[in-house]
């Protein structure tokens, strides 16, 4: 009679992570008597996957009923495959022996490759805000994919970026891989509504590439521009001085009026006007009682934006420039009238 052969018909099989893998194995003879065992890998360090006679293998089921007398099909099914299950599986026939069974013949092996989708890309930006014209770095990470081949692209508002570096780890063979990319982005004053997108494409993705996004509103700080102007008002002896705070982001802003260097009033921006580009405008005003001043007055609008050092703009109020016919008199009264923002 011909010697027993162990036949593993599949040289390689590919399985999606989470699915089951069927590893086929048949023998050509019932002789010699002895069990079948499945191993992953070869040599002394091989890993036992299934033992027909003993042991607990919760993820492994046999395709045929091994208790049937003439069974020659020793195929197994491994459930819930993960990338860690990748490798070459050997169906090995043992000859009954005492005290131990003796390895008799091995199949040629079936290589199991596992395809796994990349995780959704996560994009993170710098820890601190930066101002326009500065270059900031964004990182994108995705994990757990196999095979290793993957493409990653960066976009800012739909325009592809070219200044980035990408690494896929590990460099050698592995059960699964991760990708890490860092892109450099130059900020502009119009970037409050901008988005940075990291796009990952992989063979396992049936839809469009996976995308991770970061809103530049979380990264950018647009400092305000200040303008101080004065207009006469109908009431005698009063001048309206306004401080226009324009095109700033984020909203957090505190304004202080100084009269000849002395703090007059501090207020926090509340009712803001939003511009189309996402920045904000705000206006604060003072009613100045000119008659209370003998000398010229230096009015300063000082703005502290988003915890940054204060910026200021001054305006010289010339007392001599207000003759009586323009509403100037020498009656006593408060130098500064209380004023609320418009």
């Amino acid at each position: 009679e011909e010697e027993l052969q162990v036949i593993q018909p599949d040289k390689s099989i590919s399985v999606a992570a989470g699915e089951s893998a069927t590893l086929h194995c048949t023998v050509t003879s019932l002789i010699p008597v002895g069990p079948i065992q499945w191993f992953r890998g070869a040599g002394p360090g091989r890993e036992l996957i299934y033992n027909q006679k003993e042991g607990h293998f919760p993820r492994v089921t046999t395709v045929s009923d091994l208790t049937k007398r003439n069974n020659m099909d020793f195929s197994i099914r491994i459930s819930n495959i993960t990338p860690a299950d990748a490798g070459t599986y050997y169906c090995v026939k043992f000859r009954k022996g005492s005290p131990d069974h003796v390895e008799f013949k091995s199949g040629a092996g079936t290589e199991l490759s596992v395809r796994a989708k990349p995780s959704a890309p996560v994009v993170s930006g710098p820890a601190a805000r930066a101002t326009p014209q500065h270059t900031v770095s964004f990182t994108c990470e995705s994990h757990g994919f196999s095979p290793r081949d993957i493409t990653l692209k960066w976009f800012k508002n739909g325009n592809e970026l070219s200044d980035f570096q990408t690494n896929v780890d590990p460099a050698g063979d592995s059960v699964s891989y991760s990708i890490h990319s860092t892109a450099k982005v130059v900020l502009t004053r119009e970037d409050v509504h901008s988005q940075v997108i990291c796009e990952v494409a992989h063979v396992t993705l049936q839809g469009d590439p996976l995308r991770g996004t970061a809103n530049l509103s979380e990264t950018i700080r647009v400092p305000p521009t200040l303008e101080v102007t004065q207009q006469p008002v109908r009431a005698e002896n009063q001048v309206n001085v306004t401080c226009q705070v324009r095109k700033f982001y984020p909203q957090r802003l505190q304004l202080t009026w100084l009269e000849n260097g002395n703090v007059s009033r501090t207020e926090t921006a509340s009712t803001l006007t939003e511009n189309k580009d996402g920045t904000y405008n705000w206006m604060s005003w003072l009613l100045v009682n000119v008659s209370a001043h003998r000398d010229d007055v230096k009015l300063t609008c000082q703005v502290e934006h988003d915890g940054q050092p204060a910026v200021s703009k001054s305006h010289d109020l010339k007392v001599s420039a207000h003759p009586k016919e323009q509403g100037s008199n020498t009656a006593p009264g408060p130098a500064l009238a209380s004023a609320a923002p418009l």
Epitope: K11, S12, D149, Q206, D208
Partner: antibody, heavy 116, light 109 residues
Framework: QSVEESGGRLGTPGTPLTLTCTVS????????MGWFRQAPGKGLEYIGI?????SPYYASWVNGRFTISKTSTTMDLKMNSPTTEDTATYFC?????????????WGPGTLVTVSL | DIVMTQTPSSVEAAVGGTVTIKCQAG??????LAWYQQKPGQRPKLLIY???TLESGVPSRFKGSGSGTDYTLTISDLESADAATYYC???????????FGGGTEVVVK
């Protein structure tokens, strides 16, 4: 699980023609689908695919000659301005469950003849 | 686009014999290569994907191998039912585009 093409007929140059691929046993929202063609006595040629989310991608030679779209149960290939060179059997196919690198379910094809 | 060069364009072999078909990609395709069988008037049938993985239900007489740019389909123990045209098809993971070889007609004597 199967796919089948329809709409093949005798057409005239310049007159738009739309082919339809009808699927059964699976959802178009889960798989990439492709269109291919084979001129008489020639080899297979890739035209384009549409992703599970509905985004079309075309072979570089297409240059607007074809438009791929889909509904919940069918995928269409519109021949925008056919020429006699577009005479071929057109196949639709579904990519494999493991990835988009191969096509494991093909339709029987539908013949388009473009003639003056 | 990647160009796939398939050789030979035609091959003849006897029943029980072996046929080898080669496919060369213009650049590395990282094993993203499939093989199809097509008989006259019929749809293509997937045989092998990812260079060497046998599609379910395909006899183990069909064997795919190769990596990088060079790939091979070997059909052993030829049967008369194997008479057909065989195509290789690549997928390029960067351009995400497909390309076919020119085909090989297998004649079984």
């Amino acid at each position: 699980q199967s796919v089948e093409e329809s709409g093949g007929r005798l057409g005239t140059p310049g007159t738009p023609l739309t082919l339809t691929c009808t699927v059964s046993g699976f959802s178009l929202s889960s798989y990439v689908m492709g269109w291919f063609r084979q001129a008489p006595g020639k080899g297979l040629e890739y035209i384009g695919i549409i992703s599970s989310s509905g985004s079309p991608y075309y072979a570089s030679w297409v240059n607007g000659r074809f438009t791929i779209s889909k509904t919940s149960t069918t995928m269409d290939l519109k021949m925008n301005s056919p020429t006699t060179e577009d005479t071929a059997t057109y196949f639709c196919a579904r990519v494999g469950p493991l990835g988009v690198d191969y096509f494991n379910i093909w339709g029987p094809g539908t013949l388009v003849t473009v003639s003056l | 686009d990647i160009v796939m060069t398939q050789t030979p364009s035609s091959v003849e072999a006897a029943v029980g014999g072996t046929v080898t078909i080669k496919c060369q990609a213009g650049q590395s395709i990282n094993s993203y290569l499939a093989w199809y069988q097509q008989k006259p008037g019929q749809r293509p049938k997937l045989l092998i994907y990812y260079a060497s993985t046998l599609e379910s239900g395909v006899p183990s007489r069909f064997k795919g191998s190769g990596s990088g740019t060079d790939y091979t389909l070997t059909i052993s123990d030829l049967e008369s039912a194997d008479a057909a045209t065989y195509y290789c098809q690549s997928w390029h993971y960067i351009s995400r585009s497909y390309a076919f070889g020119g085909g090989t007609e297998v004649v079984v004597k």
